[in-house]
């Protein structure tokens, strides 16, 4: 069961896996959740008797999922969120005052303030956390010095009380890094650099995901099952280098190499290994053996067994045992199989319990039918219809769900809108006719318009709606991923514009959500078509040379959604254009990637 509550002055006895240092109990709980085996923890607060144990976070495991409770002053105990259904994030924007988080200092430089120091850490490949000496620090020579730090585990090796310094963590896991995101996997390539760890993996994609959530892995080499040396088959070597890039590439068949997706992990699944591996057996410590009907049932069983990390399903040989087989639930110290065997007929895979550690926007949506302009239920689950109720209720604009309390839309939608009270947001809608008096909607608490917005044509045509209540995600109502800063060089080829807007310039709002596949254009190309306008880097253009497919009145604020590596990204917001679907007049969209900092600043504000 899911226990969120923390137990003050309680120590969980026994079950110790390892001890790390965290600035508070809440952070200790997150560290426990992301650790492959931790189910419970005890954190030693400053009020504990032994000052040498302050800030220690003791990660624990138990076969019974519980441990004896002992009274102890200053101890705070609790359970990991592994048992909980809600989405998780490793993002920690807190700044810890008067704490020196210790690790390996590898860079010391002067910065204006702690925020700049945190940015420096976020944009440095090696940095896990930082300590900044404020301008009130007693040692004058050390004032304003920003120390970037890393450790083998990503957590501090110690924490000291120290007045007039502040510490904090890298915001890479908050999607705030400017570092490049290199998604290519290079076949027949070995990176010859420092191995920091090695794990067993079934393929290069799982190897890459493991590299992504390893604190120090910057790139990897994976040896496939065809690799000549048997002891290296299915071996995933996690690597780093001082420069952050591989120093040497060696051409070797049956090896694949690639990079950590740390800098784009919010828009790509890195914890969720959902595939099945056929004719493959995963070896590890056996947790349980159960009879089930099929490998999918075996995966479900592993997902519901809290300590299960991976499984192998073996179908029964007896013909009378139709469809039944044996499900071997397994675990290991690092969450990966200890060995992988092929040719034995097993079907293996991983628990799906870790999928909630990925951004919900990365989960696959229902397969779509290509062609046709009317959308299908659940095809664009991030699309919302924004209504105004004054003077009468009508569709005003489109919008996109980007968080459980946030809609991203266009600023120009709010011309003449005096108050958020007259707005209603409807999610999970296909036909406008579904909206009746009693249809559930979200009230709008706040309209946040970019403060540089003047007109759609001059740019900054972007706005956020903060909902009055949080949204529960369903198959027909869930978020779209924002693009990654690190993805700025990606060429999107599968882009769609959606909305209930006019189908021609003089028309009316459509009942059914319409969709159109539209190619993106370069800004140079676009400038040629709009010579009397300034097409800025904050805009992106899409459309056919011959016209015919475009967004139109009523589509404003809606998404330009592009699919890349099986994940949909909100690349643009429908903004403006000359006419609709005119020849040589592409549609102009707000270029979302250029406004990521603004979006994150507004949505992650305390």
């Amino acid at each position: 069961e899911c226990v969120i509550k923390l137990f003050s002055d309680i120590y969980f006895q026994g079950g110790d896996i390892t001890t790390v240092y965290t600035p508070n109990a809440k952070h200790c709980q997150v560290v426990c959740t992301y650790h492959p085996r931790c189910l419970l923890f005890t954190f030693m607060a400053e009020s504990s008797v032994d000052s040498t144990k302050w800030f220690s976070c003791i990660l624990k495991d138990s076969v019974t999922e519980s441990l004896p409770k002992v009274n102890m002053t200053g101890a705070i105990s609790g359970y990991s969120f592994k048992q909980c259904p809600h989405q998780l994030s490793a993002c920690n924007k807190d700044i810890y005052v008067d704490l020196d988080m210790q690790g390996m200092n590898y860079n010391g430089s002067v910065t204006k303030n702690a925020q700049e120091c945190q940015e420096r850490c976020t944009n440095d490949a090696h940095c896990h956390f930082f300590t900044y000496a404020t301008r009130q620090f007693p040692s004058a020579e050390h004032r304003n010095i920003c120390l970037l730090k890393y450790t083998q585990t990503g957590a501090p090796t110690g924490i000291r009380k120290l007045k007039k310094v502040v510490s904090g963590f890298s915001l890479k896991s908050c999607a705030l890094s400017n570092l490049a995101c290199i998604r290519d996997i290079f076949p027949s390539t070995v990176f010859a650099d420092n191995n920091i760890d090695s794990v067993v993996a079934p393929d290069a994609l799982v190897c890459r995901r493991i590299c992504t959530h390893h604190p120090n892995c910057l790139f990897f080499t994976f040896f496939s099952q065809e690799w000549p040396k048997e002891s290296h088959r299915n071996l995933c070597l996690l690597k780093t280098s001082e420069s952050g890039l591989p120093s040497t590439r060696i051409h070797k068949n049956q090896a694949l190499s690639g990079f950590s997706l740390q800098n784009c992990r919010h828009s790509i699944p890195v914890f969720c290994h959902s595939s099945f591996y056929y004719d493959t057996d995963f070896l590890g410590e056996e947790l349980d053996i159960v009879d089930v009907k099929g490998h999918e049932a075996c995966q479900k069983m592993c997902t519901s067994a809290i300590r299960c990390q991976f499984f192998t399903y073996s179908s029964s040989q007896e013909s009378h045992n139709k469809g039944k087989g044996t499900c071997y639930l397994k675990l290991s110290s690092n969450g990966s199989p200890t060995k992988i065997l092929h040719g034995r007929g097993g079907i293996s895979g991983y628990t799906l319990r870790l999928c909630k550690m990925d951004n919900v926007c990365t989960t696959k949506i229902k397969p779509r039918i290509v062609g046709g302009s009317a959308s299908l239920p659940g095809e664009w689950p991030w699309q919302v219809t924004l209504h105004t109720v004054s003077p009468t209720q009508r569709h005003l604009c489109g919008g996109s769900i980007i968080g459980n309390q946030w809609i991203l839309t266009a600023a120009h939608c709010f011309y003449g809108i005096e108050s958020p009270k007259i707005l209603r947001v409807y999610g999970g809608i296909l036909n406008q006719s579904e909206i009746k008096e009693d249809t559930a909607f979200f009230g709008v608490q706040e309209i946040i318009i970019h403060d540089q917005y003047k007109t759609a044509e001059s740019g900054y045509d972007i706005a956020l709606l903060k909902l009055e209540t949080t949204m529960n995600y369903t198959d027909s109502q869930r978020p779209i991923c924002l693009p990654s800063k690190g993805d700025r060089n990606v060429i999107y080829t599968d882009c769609w514009v959606t909305g209930w807007g006019y189908r021609k310039l003089r028309d009316k709002i459509q009942n059914t959500l319409q969709k159109a596949k539209i190619p993106l254009l370069s800004n140079e190309e676009c400038r040629k078509r709009y010579q009397r306008h300034e097409i800025t880097s904050g805009m992106i253009c899409a459309g056919y040379k011959e016209g015919g497919k475009d967004a139109c009145k009523g589509d404003s604020g809606g998404p330009l959604s592009c699919k890349h590596n099986e994940v949909w990204h909100l690349v643009g917001i429908t903004s403006w254009g000359e006419g609709c679907a005119q020849r040589e007049r592409p549609g102009i969209y707000t270029n979302v990637v250029k406004y990521l900092d603004w979006i994150l600043e507004k949505t992650q504000a305390p």
């Epitope: 390996m104 200092n105 590898y106 860079n107 010391g108 430089s109 000496a133 620090f137 007693p138 040692s139 004058a140 020579e141 050390h142 120390l147 970037l148 730090k149 120290l162 007045k163």
Partner: antibody
Framework: QVQLEESGPGLVAPSQSLSITCTVS????????IYWVRQPPGKGLEWLGM???????DYNSALKSRLSISKDNSKSQVFLKMNSLQTDDTARYYC??????????WGQGTTLTVSS | DIVMTQSHKFMSTSVGDRVSITCKAS??????VAWYQQKPGQSPKLLIY???YRNTGVPDRFTGSGSGTDFTFTISSVQAEDLAVYYC?????????FGGGTKLERL
């Protein structure tokens, strides 16, 4: 673990130059300042100078004209050079790591004798 | 440059005594003062930094106090292994400087 080790010539003639190397392990010179401190026989500690993580240097005012501190981050080595040595430069020379101006780790020191 | 003065070159004490060593700075050094212990034939060892912060592994009988120009280092109950030379050092502004040292000896 953190270690610092000084190595020097041991004996130098007056008016000659001195070069001492401090080799460190367990941490990176790009993230820590390194100090040089000396101690004449039976006397107290004297602060000579330091090199910061970013390569900036600071020196003892009285010795500034004779001192030079440099480093090689890739080799994890810090160098102390001192010229025009006199007999009163005879001392044990230590390198130490910076922790906000204090010195949290010290080498064992190397003894220098200035004598003809 | 800042001069640090330890007025007592020697201090006599017995096991179990409370002893305080003082150090005076020639100008305001805020709270940027460290204290070191040095035993014969050994390198100095950091005990206290920034006036009152104990270094890792230093017993809590060692404490420091003061600010501005006047600083005190105290051993609440002297142990035999505490007999050594103690140095103060300002780490407020470079060039950093040490006091002359105070030798703690058996009475």
């Amino acid at each position: 673990q953190v270690q610092l080790e000084e190595s020097g010539p041991g004996l130098v003639a007056p008016s000659q130059s001195l070069s001492i190397t401090c080799t460190v392990s367990g941490f990176s010179l790009t993230g820590y300042g390194i100090y040089w401190v000396r101690q004449p026989p039976g006397k107290g500690l004297e602060w000579l100078g330091m090199i910061w993580g970013d390569g900036r240097t600071d020196y003892n005012s009285a010795l500034k004209s004779r001192l030079s501190i440099s480093k090689d981050n890739s080799k994890s080595q810090v160098f102390l050079k001192m010229n025009s040595l006199q007999t009163d430069d005879t001392a044990r020379y230590y390198c130490a790591r910076d922790y906000y101006g204090s010195k949290d780790y010290w080498g064992q020191g190397t003894t220098l004798t200035v004598s003809s | 440059d800042i001069v640090m003065t330890q007025s007592h070159k020697f201090m006599s004490t017995s096991v179990g005594d409370r002893v305080s060593i003082t150090c005076k700075a020639s100008q305001d050094v805020s709270t940027a003062v460290a204290w070191y212990q040095q035993k014969p034939g050994q390198s100095p060892k950091l005990l206290i930094y920034l006036t009152s912060y104990r270094n890792t592994g230093v017993p809590d009988r060692f404490t420091g106090s003061g600010s501005g120009t006047d600083f005190t280092f105290t051993i609440s109950s002297v142990q035999a292994e505490d007999l050594a030379v103690y140095y103060c050092q300002q780490h407020y502004k470079t060039p950093y400087s040490f006091g002359g040292g105070t030798k703690l000896e058996r009475l």
